[in-house]
Interface confidence: low
């Protein structure tokens, strides 16, 4: 069972996960170092935030926050058309409640067991948790 769980985590990290490093400010943010090689289904994403090189990260990126807080943030290349479309889609999705002023840090543990932290200026376009369908 433990082996199977470890394999499952490894697969998730290989498929979508972000190799991260701490920001230059000693841990105020996590940086994505490598883009996901696969398009991310909008279904699994609830919001996104932008990673700016000016904030101490080596590459620009869009970090998509999964609906399940137990999963690691998904890292994508902002130049990709599908990334821009997904961001637009999330922007259009009605929020279930008014976003808080500024941006709270997301303290949900990631799949890697590392605490996922938001960064200043992150976009909290929360996706409705209970759409009409299911």
């Amino acid at each position: 069972m433990a082996q199977s769980l470890a394999l499952s985590l490894l697969i998730l990290v290989l498929a979508f996960g972000i190799p991260r490093t701490q920001g230059s400010d000693g841990g105020a943010q996590d940086c994505c170092l490598k883009y996901s090689q696969r398009k991310i289904p909008a279904k699994v994403v609830r919001s996104y935030r932008k990673q700016e090189p000016s904030l101490g990260c080596s590459i620009p990126a869009i970090l998509f926050l999964p609906r399940k807080r137990s999963q690691a943030e998904l890292c994508a290349d902002p130049k990709e058309l599908w990334v821009q479309q997904l961001m637009q889609h999330l922007d259009k999705t009605p929020s279930p409640q008014k976003p808080a002023q500024g941006c709270r840090k997301d303290r949900g543990a990631s799949k890697t067991g590392k605490k996922g932290k938001g960064s200043k200026g992150c976009k909290r376009t929360e996706r409705s948790q209970t759409p009409k369908g299911p």
Partner: antibody, heavy 120, light 108 residues
């Protein structure tokens, strides 16, 4: 060989209950989200429910919400669908299907289906 | 929920002809989130195309998918006898997976 095999279908009276099982083999079961999809006789496909790989996230179609419960036992490589308060309109072939890319996607592997008939 | 409408309901063609099947969504579907399935009588559906344009493992090159936003297309470049079946589109963009009502491709 990657395989899903449903069982538990049969004839049940309206208001009755049934539990479907889907036995998986040939892949790391605990890595995949799984689904139930049904097809009424001569009709199209209807998604019924999904469950995340660790079983902590589930969702249901409006038509079955509150009556059906999806669950899984990763130690047994088995997916379940508990169906209560069955109605005539629940009559269908029920398929279990695996999400293609682990966390919510198209369905790449399907079982052969099990027929549920709700009739008095 | 996103409603998918497939057209035509039935397509009557001969082997060797080109088949073009349409799937229209009631609202925006991320183009990464649409699939096509083939189903033959008495069989389970089979995944043909995922992420709108990627062929699933083992699917012949005559099957191709395209489209984005709300309009998607499945094309079978030259129909083989085994291709006569019902085809369904499916979106997995929002939290409910919805299917189109199906297009039956029959022998003329």
């Amino acid at each position: 060989e990657v395989q899903l095999l449903e069982s538990g279908g049969g004839l049940v009276q309206p208001g009755g209950s049934l539990r479907l099982s889907c036995a998986a083999s040939g892949f790391t079961f605990s890595s995949y989200w799984l689904n139930w999809v049904r097809q009424a006789p001569g009709k199209g496909l209807e998604w019924v429910s999904y469950i995340s790989n660790q079983g902590d996230d589930t969702s249901y179609a409006d038509s079955v919400k509150g009556r059906f419960t999806i669950s899984r036992d990763n130690s047994k490589n088995t997916l379940y669908l508990q169906m209560n308060s069955l109605r005539a309109e629940d009559t269908a072939v029920y398929y279990c299907a695996r999400d293609y890319q682990y966390i919510g996607d198209s369905f790449d592997i399907w079982g052969q289906g099990t027929l549920v008939t709700v009739s008095s | 929920e996103i409603v998918l409408t497939q057209s035509p309901a039935t397509l009557s063609l001969s082997p060797g002809e080109r088949a073009t099947l349409s799937c229209r969504a009631s609202q925006y579907v991320s183009y990464v989130s649409l699939a096509w399935y083939q189903q033959k009588p008495g069989q389970a559906p089979r995944l043909l195309i995922y992420d709108a344009s990627n062929r699933a493992t083992g699917i012949p090159a005559r099957f191709s998918g395209s489209g984005s936003g709300t309009d998607f297309t499945l094309t079978i470049s030259s129909l083989e006898p085994e291709d006569f079946a019902v085809y369904y589109c499916q979106q997995y963009d929002d939290l409910s997976y919805t299917f189109g009502q199906g297009t039956k491709v029959e022998i003329k």
